[in-house]
């Protein structure tokens, strides 16, 4: 008789999840000499241990502590790029501007990027059928708790000038309910962070508005200022050209406006 399985509203664990995590770990530690000491089998065991046999709506940050310990990594604290609702451009940027880092440029962020996972209470099975949706089911699910944990730690590590890329095409350029708005903003350390600099990425080709005057940006400025951190805001009017010119400043198209 097939065992009854909880049906969640979200997609199930990513196909070949264990193999993917292990392969990503091996690849990352090969590319990053400072992480060569990491034992990827232990990393996978710690990752698995955080959610296997546990109710997928009852995961805590504590569950991920063994993984956090194994994935401890030092990135230059003054070279951190946060992002909200504009992941692809942020990643393209750090691929070019190699001395800046998003969370997904760290081992733990790299391992989990774009993956979904969950287990089942009291069985060692991974649930490939469905996993809890943050809104429809529960917020304390394995994926959400993981990102909340690593995002908090990443923000806590930041110092000096912290940059954040925001999507100027969205109705809420700054969204208090995003991971950036609900976790990272509140975990920047005022004694270490001097300035948060927002880069608002424009979507429209002819959009010359100063989106730094947007009410949600003013809200972000207010939150940040109350935390005794200075705030600065920049418009990136032509993101495609911006990336191209960061990559190759001598390019003839970069001698005109971007």
């Amino acid at each position: 008789v097939p065992r009854w399985r909880q049906q969640w509203s979200g997609p199930g664990t990513t196909k070949r999840f264990p193999e993917t995590v292990l392969a990503r770990c091996v690849k990352y530690t090969e590319i990053h000499p400072e992480m060569r000491h990491v034992d990827c089998q232990s990393v996978w065991d710690a990752f698995k241990g955080a959610f296997i046999s546990k109710h997928p709506c009852n995961i805590t940050e504590e569950d991920y502590q063994p993984l956090m310990k194994l994935g401890t990594q030092t990135v230059p604290c003054n070279k951190i790029l946060l992002w909200s609702r504009i992941k692809d451009l942020a990643h393209q940027f750090t691929q070019v501007q190699r001395d800046m880092f998003t969370l997904e440029d760290t081992l733990l962020g790299y391992l989990a990027d774009d993956l979904t996972w969950c287990g089942e209470f009291n069985t060692s099975k991974i649930n490939y059928q469905s996993c809890p949706d943050w809104r429809k089911d529960c917020s304390n699910n394995p994926v959400s708790v993981f990102w909340k944990t690593v995002s908090r730690r990443f923000a806590e590590a930041a110092c000096d000038v912290v940059h954040v890329m925001l999507n100027g095409s969205r109705s809420k350029i700054f969204d208090k309910n995003s991971t950036f708005g609900s976790v990272e903003v509140h975990n920047l350390q005022p004694e270490k962070v001097q300035t948060l600099e927002a880069w608002v990425i424009h979507g429209g080709r002819e959009d010359s508005r100063d989106l730094c005057q947007d009410p949600t940006i003013k809200e972000l400025e207010s939150i940040i200022s109350k935390r005794n951190i200075q705030f600065s805001c920049k418009n990136i009017y032509r993101p495609d050209k911006f990336l191209q010119c960061v990559k190759n400043p001598e390019d003839s198209s970069c001698t005109s406006e971007i």
Partner: nanobody
Framework: DVQLQASGGGLVQAGGSLRLSCEFS????????MGWFRQFPGKEREFVAA????????DYSDSVKGRFTISRDNVKSTMYLVMNSLKPEDTAVYYC???????????????????WGRGTRVTVSS
Amino acid sequence: DVQLQASGGGLVQAGGSLRLSCEFSGRTFSGFAMGWFRQFPGKEREFVAAINWSGSSVDYSDSVKGRFTISRDNVKSTMYLVMNSLKPEDTAVYYCAEARSAELGSSRKIQGYDQWGRGTRVTVSS
């Protein structure tokens, strides 16, 4: 820390030259336009010159065009203003600033800038 520090001001005779420097230290990424403004006693700051992020595009106020030259060295994190053929009416406090964008779209407006350095005084005697 992000700091814009203007230096190079001083006392010079009319017809003489000065080179102002603005160091934009504490920056990981220097991909934004920058500008020079000046302020006469009791007046608003006024636009002098601006340069885009790569140094390939510049803009000058009519009053300094042909006499002043703006440039930047992103490796040294420094912007310059070479001031030739100085006149007594150039006497002012000069400020450097970083713009809100990479290009020069709103570079003549004070609101187009969000980081300001401390000023350096230029006095031109007749």
